[in-house]
């Protein structure tokens, strides 16, 4: 069947170092737990994370993030799933695409990571 | 079966601070992001606040920035807003709520626990 | 901030008739629009989310629809225990923001 995915529709927010959590889903709710799931970055369509046949893909992912990604998936059975990116780099900013892929059927939505330096301060002064 | 259940409000002085708790079960609590949306005596649903589902990120509305603090303890499935400096106006019953990632409804809520600040 | 608006404040209807309820916001939330019912001493009950999807358990009479800045929640014939407030919401961007509220009371 047919399905939306949807993302943040406003910028997350991660401070160089932490962690940043991405977070999407599809619409309406179903179980994804036989689909595949993934990011990637746009427009340059690095992979970011995959998976697929129940299982992570660490093969697949751009060298820049291996080691770096977890799937959170404890609600995939809803159509939910998080991807946290661990050590967040500057070079992690950019926009970033979810999908979610049931046989052929492909759906996706597009969401943006900033990423602030903790020890950046402005004199209000 | 999904369930929220709030505690700690009652009555309290204009200035006094209380600290509402909301025990969560039957989901992966830490999975989800929480909310406090609150109802003033016959009126309509304001948010408060949201914590992420690890809890490193929070949010206010600006009626309570400053006042409010949410946080969250996963480790005992466990919710709460430490309100303080009280104001006439904070009276209402407060309702925990969940969402998914900041990027979803409320789909469940909790019965609410009822704040009331006079003298 | 984005503001919800919805109308009308007062809805009167008998049962079996249509109701249909407005909620507008002031700049566009695309579909991240949900709607609540809520009955006197009771918590917000999720109907609808991102739009025009029911949430699980909920009648088929209840539907919503629109996109961007204009939605509409249609209830196709009342039951007598639709009567009660409902609430809009978007939650797109922070501060997630609250219609006023529907009042669907009995004519």
């Known amino acids: 069947g047919q399905f939306r995915v949807i993302g943040p529709g406003y910028p997350i927010r991660a401070l160089v170092g932490d962690e940043a959590e991405l977070p999407c889903r599809i619409s309406p709710g179903k179980n994804a737990t036989g689909m595949e799931v993934g990011w990637y970055r746009s427009p340059f369509s690095r992979v970011v994370h995959l998976y697929r046949n129940g299982k992570d893909q660490d093969a697949e992912q751009a060298p820049e993030y291996r080691g770096r990604t977890e799937l959170l998936k404890e609600t995939i059975s809803e159509g939910k799933v998080t991807l946290r990116i661990q050590n967040v780099r500057f070079s992690d900013e950019g926009g970033y695409t979810c999908f979610f892929r049931d046989h052929s059927y492909q759906e996706e939505a597009a969401m943006e990571l900033k990423v602030e330096d903790p020890f950046y301060w402005v004199n209000p002064g | 079966q999904v369930q929220l259940v709030e505690s700690g409000g009652g009555l309290v002085q204009p200035g006094g601070s209380l600290r509402l708790s909301c025990a969560a079960s039957g989901f992966t609590f830490s999975s989800y992001a929480m909310n406090w949306v609150r109802q003033a005596p016959g009126k309509g649903l304001e948010w408060v606040s949201a914590?992420?589902?690890?809890?490193?990120?929070?949010y206010y509305a600006d009626s309570v920035k400053g006042r409010f603090t949410i946080s969250r303890d996963n480790s005992k499935n466990t919710l709460y807003l430490q309100v303080n400096s009280l104001r006439a106006e904070d009276t209402a019953v407060y309702y925990c709520?969940?969402?998914?990632?900041?990027?979803?409804?409320?789909?469940?809520w909790g019965q609410g626990t009822l704040v009331t600040v006079s003298s | 901030e984005i503001v919800m608006t919805q109308s009308p404040a007062t809805l009167s209807l008998s049962p079996g008739e249509r109701a249909t309820l407005s909620c507008r916001a002031s700049q566009s939330v695309s579909s991240y629009l949900a709607w609540y019912q809520q009955k006197p001493g009771q918590a917000p009950r999720l109907l609808i989310y991102d739009a025009s999807n029911r949430a699980t358990g909920i009648p088929a009479r209840f539907s919503g629809s629109g996109s961007g800045t204009d939605f509409t929640l249609t209830i196709s014939r009342l039951e007598p225990e639709d009567f009660a407030v409902y609430y809009c919401?978007?939650?797109?961007?922070?501060?997630?923001?609250f219609g006023q509220g529907t009042r669907l009371e009995i004519k």
């Open positions: 919401q978007q939650y797109g961007s922070s501060p997630y923001t």
């Open positions: 709520a969940r969402d998914y990632g900041g990027i979803s409804p409320f789909d469940y």
């Open positions: 914590i992420s589902g690890s809890g490193g990120s929070t």
